[in-house]
C-alpha cells in the first residue's frame, strides 16, 4: 500500500491554519464553456485566462469570450475583456505567448465571414495593454515567434501563403505562396516546403524545401522530392522520395541544408512514417515504423552527425502517423527515457534506458507492491507506466508521467505492477533516483504537480464527483497531508502551476453547478508558510546519480562521466526558493566499450559489449555517402557515443578517408541548388 496519512507521518505543524490564510478563491462571472490559461513570462506572476462560450444557433454559432489577467500567480483576477474591445477570441489558436521574458502576447480574433483578413490583438507589456491590428490575410496557424527575436513573427494563411512580420505583428508581408509547412530555425532562419502543382496533399513527396535567412529577401532551394521535414537539436531532417519507387528515406543536414547526407536508416513505404522522438545538439532518437498496420516500429539512435544509426529498441509502440507513443524524456536525470513496447502477445510493456538508448530494461518492481493479475509469477514482475497511449485509450489515467529538470531524480507516473500494462485502475508511483527504483505514492489515479523544485508535491484525486480536498507532501511523496480548500466541493477540471516547478503556488480549477447556471472557479493556494524558512547547507545531502554499485570505482558513470548532486534531504521542510539552482559536480570517467556505439557496418550481439562486423559486409570495403561524397571508412567497429565525455581507458581506432568520388543521393547536390532573391 501507499504511504499513509498516519498522525505522525511527516506531519507539518499547524498546516491547516497556514494554508487557510493563503487560499484565494476567484469566481469567474461566466457561463461555463471552455477555459484556457497561459503564463506570461517567467517569475512574473502574470496569468492570462480566456473563457469562451459557444451557443450553436440554427445558421451560425454565437460566441462570447472573456479575458482575465492576474499578476499575483492567480490569487486575484481582473476582467480585461474591454482591452480587446470585447472581441470573441479564437480558442483553437490559443494565446501566443512570446519566448523568454519578452512579455509579448498575441490573441487571434474571430472575424465575420466577408472580411478581407483576420484580426489580432498584440501586447508587449505582459498583457497590461493591447493593440488591435487587422491582418491582410486569414491565419491558418497560430503566430510563431522567432526563438531569437520575439519581434519576428511568421504565420501561414488559409490560402497557403507564408507571411512574416518584423515588428511584432504591426505590418505583415507575404514572402512566399503555396507553402505547406514553415518552421523557424536558428539565427532567424525560416525553413518551409512549397508545392508546385495542386496542393500540399497532392504534392506530398514532390514538395520543395526552401530556406530564407533574411526574412524573405532571398531564398535557397535546399531540397526536392520532399515528403516532410523536421528540426531537432542542431539537425535538419528531410524525408525524400526515392527515384524508382514510392519509398522514402531520411536525409540529414547539420549546416542548415547546404549539404546533406543520407541517414543510414531503413527506407519506409507509403503507409509508414519516421518520427523524431527526441533530439539535442549531440544526437537524435528516430522511430522508424514497421511495414503494415502493426502499431510499432524500431527506435534508432544516431551518431553525432545524425548519419550512422544504431538499433536501440525493437517493437516500439507508436500507433499511426501523428498517433500515440509513450516515449518520454525523463528531464530530472540525464540519459533517462521511458517508453512502451508491444510484445508478441500484444500486451504493452514499459521499458527504460539510463544511457540514452544504449540499453533498455524493464522498470524494477516497487518494494511496497504486489504483482497484479497480469503476472505469471507473483514474485517476479515489473512496473509498467501509463502515458499518452493509455490516455488516448480512455483508461483511467488523468496525467502523463511528470519530471522537472530542477527536481533532480524525481519522476511521478501512473502505473501498474505486473507483466504488462493493466486496464485496471492505476496507482501513482514515484521514483527519487530517476527511474531506478519506484515506490507506490498514492492509491488510485490522481492529478499531480511539483512545486518549489521538488520541495512540495501536490496531488488531487481523479474523481467524477465534486472534490474539495488537496493532498501535499514535503518529503518527496512518502507522507501526505490533506487540506480541505473549500466547504463547497467543485467539479475539478485541472491543476495549474507556473511552468518550471519553481513556484509555491498551485491553482485548482473547476466549476460549480447549480440548478440554473454553472460558473468557473479557481482556488489558488500558496504554500510559502508551509515551508517557513529558506533551506540552508545542512538541509542538503550528496547524491550520486546513476549509482548502482557503491563499491565500484566507476559507479555512476553514464556517457563517460558521473554527476554528484546536492539534494534536499527528504526530512527537511524548507524553501528551495525561486532562485534555486541545481548544484552538481561532474567527474570524468575512464573509457570502456560501453562508451562507444557500433560504427557503420557493425552491430552488437545481444548481451555483448563488443561490436562485430555485419556478416553481409564482411570483407567488403566500407564505403558510404557523406555530404554528397563517397567516403572510405577504416574502423575496428566503434564510434564514441554522442555527448560521451570519457577519457583514457579503451581507445578504438577509427579513420575516415575521402574517396573523392561523387555518390548518388536523391537530393540536389550542393552545386545544383538554386538561389533567388525577391
Amino acid at each position: 500500500s501507499a504511504p499513509g496519512e498516519d498522525e505522525e507521518c511527516g506531519r507539518v505543524r499547524d498546516f491547516v491554519a497556514k494554508l487557510a490564510n493563503n487560499t484565494h478563491q476567484h469566481v469567474f462571472d461566466d457561463l461555463r464553456g471552455s477555459v484556457s490559461l497561459s503564463w506570461v513570462g517567467d517569475s512574473t506572476g502574470v496569468i492570462l485566462v480566456l473563457t469562451t462560450f459557444h451557443v450553436p444557433l440554427v445558421i451560425m454559432t454565437f460566441g462570447q469570450s472573456k479575458l482575465y489577467r492576474s499578476e499575483d500567480y492567480g490569487k486575484n483576477f481582473k476582467d480585461i475583456t474591454d482591452l480587446i474591445n470585447n472581441t470573441f477570441i479564437r480558442t483553437e489558436f490559443g494565446m501566443a505567448i512570446g519566448p523568454e521574458n519578452s512579455g509579448k502576447v498575441v490573441l487571434t480574433a474571430e472575424v465575420s465571414g466577408g472580411s478581407r483578413g483576420g484580426r489580432i490583438f498584440r501586447s508587449s507589456d505582459f498583457a497590461k495593454n493591447f493593440v488591435q491590428t487587422d491582418l491582410p490575410f486569414h491565419p491558418l496557424t497560430q503566430m510563431m515567434y522567432s526563438p531569437q527575436n520575439s519581434d519576428y513573427l511568421l504565420a501561414l494563411s488559409t490560402e497557403n501563403g507564408l507571411w512574416v512580420s518584423k515588428n511584432f505583428g504591426g505590418k505583415w508581408e507575404e514572402i512566399h505562396k503555396a507553402v505547406c509547412l514553415a518552421k523557424w530555425g536558428s539565427d532567424n532562419t525560416i525553413f518551409f516546403t512549397t508545392y508546385a502543382n495542386g496542393s500540399c496533399k497532392a504534392d506530398l513527396g514532390a514538395l520543395e524545401l526552401w530556406r530564407t535567412s533574411d526574412l524573405g529577401k532571398s531564398f535557397k532551394t535546399i531540397g526536392v522530392k520532399i515528403y516532410s521535414f523536421g528540426l531537432g537539436g542542431r539537425f535538419l531532417f528531410a524525408s525524400v522520395m526515392a527515384d524508382k519507387d514510392t519509398t522514402r528515406r531520411i536525409h540529414v543536414s547539420t549546416d542548415q541544408g547546404d549539404t546533406w547526407s543520407m541517414a543510414q536508416l531503413p527506407s519506409v513505404g507509403q503507409e509508414q512514417f519516421y518520427s523524431i522522438l527526441a533530439a539535442n545538439d549531440d544526437m537524435v532518437f528516430m522511430h522508424v515504423d514497421e511495414p503494415g498496420d502493426t502499431g510499432f516500429g524500431t527506435i534508432f539512435t544516431s551518431d553525432d552527425r545524425g548519419i550512422v544509426y544504431s538499433k536501440s529498441l525493437d517493437r516500439h509502440l507508436y500507433t499511426t502517423t501523428g498517433g500515440e507513443t509513450d516515449f518520454t524524456n525523463v528531464t530530472s536525470l540525464r540519459g533517462v527515457y521511458i517508453t512502451s513496447v508491444l510484445s508478441e502477445d500484444n500486451s504493452i510493456q514499459t521499458m527504460i534506458t539510463f544511457d540514452q538508448g544504449g540499453r533498455w530494461t524493464h522498470l524494477r518492481k516497487p518494494e511496497n507492491s504486489e504483482c497484479d493479475a497480469t503476472a505469471k509469477n507473483k514474485n517476479e514482475c515489473s512496473l509498467h507506466i501509463h502515458a499518452s497511449y493509455s490516455i488516448s485509450q480512455k483508461l483511467n489515467v488523468p496525467m502523463a508521467p511528470l519530471s522537472e529538470p530542477n527536481a533532480v531524480g524525481i519522476v511521478i507516473a501512473h502505473g501498474s505492477v505486473g507483466d504488462a500494462i493493466s486496464v485496471m485502475v492505476p496507482d501513482v508511483y514515484i521514483s527519487d533516483d530517476g527511474g531506478y527504483s519506484w515506490t507506490k505514492m498514492l492509491e488510485g489515479p490522481h492529478y499531480y504537480t511539483i512545486l518549489d523544485s521538488g520541495g512540495i508535491i501536490v496531488a488531487i484525486e481523479h474523481s467524477s464527483r465534486p472534490i474539495n480536498v488537496i493532498k501535499f507532501s514535503t518529503d518527496e511523496g512518502q507522507c501526505w497531508q490533506t487540506y480541505t480548500f473549500t466547504r463547497d466541493p467543485i467539479y475539478f477540471t485541472g491543476l495549474a502551476s507556473e511552468p518550471g516547478a519553481r513556484s509555491m503556488n498551485i491553482s485548482i480549477w473547476g466549476f460549480t453547478e447549480s440548478f440554473l447556471t454553472s460558473q468557473w472557479v479557481s482556488y489558488t493556494i500558496d504554500f510559502k508558510d508551509i515551508l517557513e524558512r529558506n533551506c540552508e547547507e545542512k538541509d542538503y545531502t550528496i547524491w550520486l546519480a546513476h549509482s548502482t554499485d557503491p563499491e565500484d570505482y566507476e559507479d555512476g558513470c553514464i556517457l563517460g562521466y558521473k554527476e554528484q548532486f546536492l539534494r534536499l534531504r527528504k526530512s527537511s521542510v524548507c524553501q528551495n526558493g525561486r532562485d534555486y539552482v541545481v548544484t552538481k559536480q561532474p567527474s570524468i570517467c575512464l573509457c570502456s566499450l560501453e562508451d562507444f556505439l557500433c560504427d557503420f557496418g557493425y552491430y552488437r550481439p545481444e548481451n555483448d559489449s563488443k561490436c562485430v562486423e555485419q556478416p553481409e559486409l564482411k570483407g567488403h570495403d566500407l564505403e558510404f555517402c557523406l555530404y554528397g561524397r563517397e567516403e572510405h571508412l577504416t574502423t575496428n567497429g566503434y564510434r564514441k557515443i554522442p555527448g560521451d565525455k570519457c577519457q583514457g581507458g579503451v581507445n578504438p581506432v577509427r579513420e575516415v578517408k575521402d574517396l573523392k568520388k561523387k555518390c548518388t543521393s536523391n537530393f540536389l547536390s550542393p552545386e545544383k541548388q538554386n538561389s533567388k532573391s525577391n
Epitope: 505522525e8 507521518c9 511527516g10 506531519r11 531524480g409 527519487d432 533516483d433 518529503d475 512518502q478 507522507c479 547547507e537 545542512k538 542538503y540 545531502t541 550528496i542 547524491w543 550520486l544 549509482s547 557503491p550 563499491e551 565500484d552 570505482y553 559507479d555 555512476g556 554528484q564 546536492l566 539534494r567 534531504r569 527528504k570 526530512s571 527537511s572 548544484t583 559536480q585 567527474s587
Partner: antibody, heavy 122, light 107 residues
Framework: QVQLVQSGAEVKKPGSSVKVSCKAS????????ISWVRQAPGQGLEWMGR????????NYAQKFQGRVTITADKSTSTAYMELSSLRSEDTAVYYC???????????????WGQGTLVTVSS | DIQMTQSPSSLSASVGDRVTITCRAS??????LAWYQQKPEKAPKSLIY???SLQSGVPSRFSGSGSGTDFTLTISSLQPEDFATYYC?????????FGQGTRLEIK
Amino acid sequence: QVQLVQSGAEVKKPGSSVKVSCKASGGTFSNYAISWVRQAPGQGLEWMGRIIPIFGIANYAQKFQGRVTITADKSTSTAYMELSSLRSEDTAVYYCARDRRGFSGYEVFDYWGQGTLVTVSS
Amino acid sequence: DIQMTQSPSSLSASVGDRVTITCRASQGISSWLAWYQQKPEKAPKSLIYATSSLQSGVPSRFSGSGSGTDFTLTISSLQPEDFATYYCQQYNSYPITFGQGTRLEIK
C-alpha cells in the same frame, strides 16, 4: 570493499587541539558524506558533524560549533576532524562513518572507521 | 535537538527468546530512524534504516516498526551473537541524535 582507516590514539593536554584523520579506500571518496561520531567511555554515541568532500560543505552539531573543524583532502581520500580547546570530558573514541546509500535522506552509517581514542589529561 | 529515549536501558534474555527494544523521539521523526548493534571495543554496525528496512547481510530475525515518535526493534529468536548494545538513531533533522543504548545480556 570499502574501508575507513583512522589515525592512531592520541593523548592531549587540556586546552590543546587534536586532529584525527580518516582515510577511505574502495569505492570513490567523493561520492559520499563523511560524519564524525564520538563515544565517551561507557557512554552512548554522539554525532559531531559531517562533510561533503566534493562540495566542501561541512555542518556541525551546535554543541561543538566553534570548536570542531571537519575538512577533507580529495587527492588523498582523507577526511579530518580537528577539535580544539580540549577538556577532560572530550576523552572519547572518535569514529568517522560513511553512508553507503548516498541519498534517500539516509544518514545511516554503513561503514565505520576502527575508532581513535583521544585521551585528554593534564 | 530531538531527544531519543530507549527502554529498557538493559535487559537479560536467553537464546531463542523474542526481544523487543523501544525508542521514543521527543518529536515526530516520520520514519527516519535507524538501529545499530555495537559489541565491546568495536565500531557500531548498521542493522535497520528507514524504521523497517533491513540492511543487506543482516539476518531476518531482526525487524523494525513504528512511525512518528514510537519505534521498536524486535529480535524474533535470540542467537548467541546477538548479545550486544543496541542504539537507535534519528536522522530526521540535524543534529543527528542517538538513543542512550540498550544493553542486551545473557540471562
